[in-house]
Interface confidence: low
């Protein structure tokens, strides 16, 4: 009952299956690998998406930290363990009893240790900046007219609200889109700066996660805004625990 | 139970001002947006704006933008619409209404019983 | 702004009938349409939200369907209490804006 009801699919998440066997036949759609129930009025949480993709090949890469407790995705994708409203479970455990903590937004935060290891609550990530060029353009975007439209974005497509938007810094042909939502100014019903930079990675490198519409078309009055490359790095409310051997 | 309570009518005259107050109990107020819908009689509503309880961010229909001035007190959970200019126009019911921050929330749950403003002379 | 579009300002219906409410909007809203009911002298009352999610103690009688542009709103048997003003409202973006109504009436 959460889907497009004529052709019973789900508008923010294609990997679903949906059928109509909701209350009174009405549509209802659940996320393949978990079989949990989704909202397809809203976005899918990124645990329950990286569930969902696990067949996809393995995606590795290493980045530069902006501040010593940024934290960035080097571990690709794995199957996470996700809690009955789809957030990542603090625990993430693989197959050969090799455990470790996460973030909200399912980053490990610590060092890899076995079943012992304990992850007492799941931090919040509550600042990301996500880190652009674009290629290569006539001339530099106007600032605001970049800032306006990213904003936009944000808000249209992944329905984040503006203030949690906290930035767009422009240096052509680098673009830092800051997000920040801390664990009290997140109201029920609002959407996670972790699932909307997700969306946004996944829109950016044209596997978008929506179903049935097209793949981003950023322009800036009028002019195309085509991303060569994105790093995204990751702050938590509580500095991630790593030995000093990872940091040196 | 949750709840918006908002005075029964006020009479002004054209062109002064009248300050509008819709109490909220029941809630955590500074959890959801404060909107104010206007009616006039026979027909559709209409938004004027809403306010962040928070931080006092407000955003307006550009319609109301030059007359329309929202406010909070937060120890008193109380909201505040402040029209000025006042014409026949503006006599109508105004309701406050609750909304959800997330924009997927945007719709209205909880509502005044509204305020009818007479304009007359 | 979005207009929100509501084809029949009034329709008539009788008691135990399947009525439906259409509302079109000028642009695509996703899933982003609510659905309220107004009696007279009073405030409204939201029954659907997000095009086809029914509020907390809405009767099932009441639902919603739609995506992008095009909505419906449709009582499954028609009671008695039921005929009265119902309005649609976008809340895709700023500025929230509602259908002029449509009115329920006996046949």
């Known amino acids: 009952h959460t889907a497009a009801q004529d052709n019973c699919t789900c508008p923010t998440n294609k990997m679903t299956v949906c059928s109509p066997d909701g209350p009174g036949g009405r549509c209802q759609c659940r996320a393949l690998g978990s079989g949990m129930a989704v909202d397809c009025s809203t976005l899918t949480s990124k645990c329950l998406l990286l569930k969902a993709r696990m067949s996809a090949p393995k995606n590795a890469r290493t980045l530069v930290r902006p501040s010593e407790h940024a934290l960035v995705d080097n571990d690709g994708l794995y199957d996470p363990d996700c809690d009955p409203e789809g957030r990542f479970k603090a625990r993430q455990c693989n197959q050969t009893s090799v455990c470790w903590c996460v973030n909200s937004v399912g980053v490990r935060r610590t060092d890899k240790g076995d079943l012992s290891l304990r992850c007492d609550e799941l931090v919040r990530t509550h600042h990301i900046l996500i880190d652009l060029r674009h290629r290569p353009t006539a001339g530099a975007f106007n600032h605001s007219d970049l800032d306006a439209e990213l904003r936009r974005l944000f808000r249209e497509r992944y329905r984040l609200h503006p203030k949690f938007v906290a930035a767009v810094h422009y240096e052509q042909p680098t673009i830092q889109i800051e997000l920040r939502q801390n664990t009290s100014q997140k109201a029920a019903g609002d959407v996670d700066i972790g699932d909307a930079a997700y969306y946004f990675e996944r829109d950016i490198k044209g596997e978008s996660l929506f179903q049935g519409r097209g793949g981003l078309d950023l322009r800036v009055r009028g002019e195309p805004l085509q991303v060569e490359r994105t790093l995204i790095y990751y702050l938590d409310e509580i500095p991630p625990k790593f030995s000093m051997k990872r940091l040196t | 139970q949750v709840q918006l309570q908002q005075p029964g009518a006020e009479l002004v005259r054209p062109g002064a001002s009248v300050k509008l107050s819709c109490r909220a109990s029941g809630y955590t107020f500074t959890n959801y947006w404060m909107n104010w819908v206007k009616q006039r009689p026979e027909q559709g509503l209409e938004w004027i704006g809403r306010i962040d309880p928070n931080d006092s961010e407000t955003h307006y229909n550009q319609k109301f933008k030059d007359r329309a001035i929202l406010t909070v007190d937060k120890a008193s959970n109380t909201a505040y619409m402040q029209l000025s200019g006042l014409t026949s126009e503006d006599s109508a019911v105004h309701y406050c209404?609750?909304?959800?921050?997330?924009?997927?929330?945007?719709?209205?749950?909880?509502w005044g019983a509204g305020t009818t403003v007479t304009v007359s002379s | 702004d979005i207009v929100m579009t509501q084809s029949h300002k009034f329709m008539s219906t009788s008691v135990g009938d399947r009525v439906s409410i259409t509302c079109k909007a000028s642009?695509?809203?996703?899933?982003?349409v609510a659905w309220y009911q107004q009696k007279p002298g009073q405030s409204p009352k939201l029954l659907i939200y997000?095009?086809?999610y029914r509020y907390t103690g809405v009767p099932d009688r009441f639902a919603g369907s739609g995506y992008g542009t095009d909505f419906t709103f449709t009582i499954s048997s028609v009671q008695t209490e039921d005929l009265t003003v119902y309005h649609c409202?976008?809340?895709?973006?700023?500025?929230?804006?509602f259908g002029p109504g449509t009115r329920l009436e006996l046949k």
């Open positions: 409202q976008q809340h895709y973006s700023t500025p929230l804006t």
């Open positions: 997000s095009a086809s």
């Open positions: 209404a609750r909304s959800g921050f997330g924009s997927t929330y945007w719709f209205f749950d909880v």
């Open positions: 642009q695509d809203v996703s899933t982003a």
